[in-house]
Interface confidence: medium
């Protein structure tokens, strides 16, 4: 949560002198409450923007938006608060508009914008207006609160933002899930243009229950350039576990823009209509790590096999 | 070589909560999961639950839910088991395990004694 | 909850004699059943999994086999140091569960 680094930041307009300042989120009209304060905002809009940074990056920022009033209390407003809070983090950030001249009425209800304030994909805000001077301890309350949830990376907007795109946001892997039997499924995906590993981890599921009843890690190691923009598959083999029916392979890369925070794409098999029980393995891959030697993968909790391809 | 070093032995008194340690090296932690299975004087194995190290996933033994909570910390190769509110009945060795459903190594165990 | 029960609860045996350990299980486990060797003030020890293969550092005298609902852990030649209580426990179903062990003592 920072501000847009290098906008002048403006909220002057035709009939009012206005300076934009940092805020410590604790105005001086809480210390020193006034006789008289002014109503709260009417209306607070917010809606996502994308700005550029004067590094040229593209960055997420909250578009804020609120109108007046039309009461006299107007010819008490000194300026406003402007608060973001990240909910996940408590973590705030404040500006202070700061009003060089007195308000008039006109024509027009007063309307006031401010889209600095640079946020993170998949996060949730309050922002919050809070007219100045603040009210005496008993007044009533002068400010006005909305939430916005910032949309992921998925999003159409957010995928060509920096933020997304340092995370791996432009890679689709495409994952496709089949089961072959009772014991296999088989995971497609495509391959990044980077020489990088991917981990699959494999989370099973009993039907419409949450908690998992199986885990198994595999690991692809890096492909090589001739491989970049392939399918690759692999094929994972599922515990023999009563009811363990329903699969979620989750994909995760290790770009190295984002190392071990990339973006994870997922894809679910639901449980059979009907589940007939399983039959029993016959043959299985040793719960061991190779004794020696090394393996290309290590599985984490299960004796399932599993192998994988490039295609071309 | 694969270890798993648990916290040393605890006494408690009964309602109160403890919270037992168990520091794995000599393998990727995120690679495997961590069980945990406890024994009571004289007596038998009883499994409760299973955390996984790569998702934080948990499956608790129906008896404890609702007073047990597992966690990790992955920046120092740790999982915790704490029980509250505890009972005389929850005397026992606790032991962590490695891996989900067959356990492949074992920490030395910790005595938890609840006593008033 | 699958109940695992082992037989006997006590074994005694000569060294060098052959032990034959049970555990039955309440409902078809398939091939989801290890076994641990355990010594007073000491963790489980893991012996055989998935019913029938050694665990790594293992000595061949002991073996598992069995399916289903019956299984057996057998020690061919019993040492001074095989001496213990040796559990059985399924992994087909959750909650994974322990049979009451069996005390293998010197006869």
């Known amino acids: 949560l920072r501000l847009l680094d290098h906008r002048a930041l403006v909220c002057s307009q035709p009939g009012l002198n206005c300076t934009v300042k940092n805020s410590t989120c604790l105005d001086d009209s809480w210390i020193h409450p006034r006789n008289l304060t002014p109503s709260s905002p009417k209306n607070i809009y917010i809606n996502l923007s994308v700005s550029s940074t004067q590094h040229g990056e593209l960055v997420p920022v909250l578009h804020v938006e609120w109108t007046l009033q039309t009461d006299a209390s107007i010819l008490y407003l000194e300026g406003a608060e402007l608060s973001v809070l990240q909910l996940n983090t408590n973590e705030r950030l404040c500006v202070r508009f700061e009003f060089l001249s007195k308000l008039r009425h006109h024509h027009r209800r007063w309307r006031f914008t401010f889209s600095h304030f640079v946020v993170d994909p998949d996060q949730e805000y309050e922002v919050t207006v809070h007219h100045l001077p603040k009210p005496i301890p008993d007044g009533d309350p002068n400010h006005q609160s909305k939430n916005f949830l910032v949309p992921d990376c998925e999003h159409a907007r957010m995928k060509v933002t920096t933020p997304c795109m340092s995370s791996g946001s432009l890679w689709d892997p495409n994952i496709t899930v089949e089961t072959l039997d009772t014991q296999h499924l088989r995971v497609d995906f495509t391959l990044w243009n980077e020489s990088t590993h991917y981990q699959i981890l494999l989370t099973s599921f009993p039907h419409m229950e949450n908690h998992s009843c199986f885990e198994h890690m595999h690991h692809i190691p890096a492909p090589r350039p001739e491989e970049f923009h392939q399918r690759s598959n692999v094929t994972l083999t599922l515990r023999n576990l009563k009811g363990c029916c329903r699969h979620q392979v989750q994909i995760q890369p290790f770009f190295s823009s984002c190392l071990n925070d990339c973006l994870r794409h997922s894809a679910t098999v639901s449980c059979p209509e009907m589940p007939d029980t399983p039959e029993p393995i016959p043959d299985y891959m040793p719960l061991w790590e190779p004794r020696s030697g090394s393996s290309d993968y290590k599985d984490d909790d299960d004796k399932g096999s599993s192998h994988h391809h490039h295609h071309h | 070589q694969v270890q798993l070093v648990q916290s040393g032995a605890e006494v408690k008194k009964p309602g109160a909560s403890v919270k037992v340690s168990c520091k794995a090296s000599?393998?990727?932690?995120?690679?495997?999961?961590i069980s945990w299975v406890r024994q009571a004087p004289g007596q038998g194995l009883e499994w409760m639950g299973w955390?996984?190290?790569?998702?934080?996933?948990?499956n608790y033994a129906q008896k404890l839910q609702g007073r047990v909570t597992m966690t990790t910390d992955t920046s120092t190769s740790t999982a915790y088991m704490e029980l509250r509110s505890l009972r005389s009945d929850d005397t026992a060795v606790y032991y962590c395990?490695?891996?989900?459903?067959?356990?492949?190594?074992w920490g030395q165990g910790t005595l938890v004694t609840v006593s008033s | 909850e699958i109940v695992m029960t082992q037989s006997p609860a006590t074994l005694s045996v000569s060294p060098g004699e052959r032990a034959t350990l049970s555990c039955r299980a309440s409902?078809?486990?398939?091939?989801?059943l290890a076994w641990f060797q355990q010594k007073p003030g000491q963790a489980p020890r893991p012996l055989i999994y998935?019913?029938?293969t050694r665990a790594t550092g293992v000595p061949a005298r002991f073996s598992g086999s069995g399916s289903g609902t019956d299984f057996t852990l057998t020690i061919s030649s019993l040492q001074s140091e095989d001496f213990a209580v040796y559990y059985c426990?399924?992994?087909?179903?959750?909650?994974?569960?322990f049979g009451g062990g069996t005390k293998v003592e010197i006869k």
């Open positions: 955390i996984s190290t790569y998702s934080g996933n948990t």
């Open positions: 409902q078809s486990v398939s091939s989801n």
């Open positions: 998935d019913a029938s």
């Open positions: 000599g393998y990727t932690f995120t690679r495997y999961g």
């Open positions: 426990q399924q992994y087909d179903n959750w909650p994974l569960t």
């Open positions: 395990a490695r891996r989900q459903l067959y356990f492949d190594y």
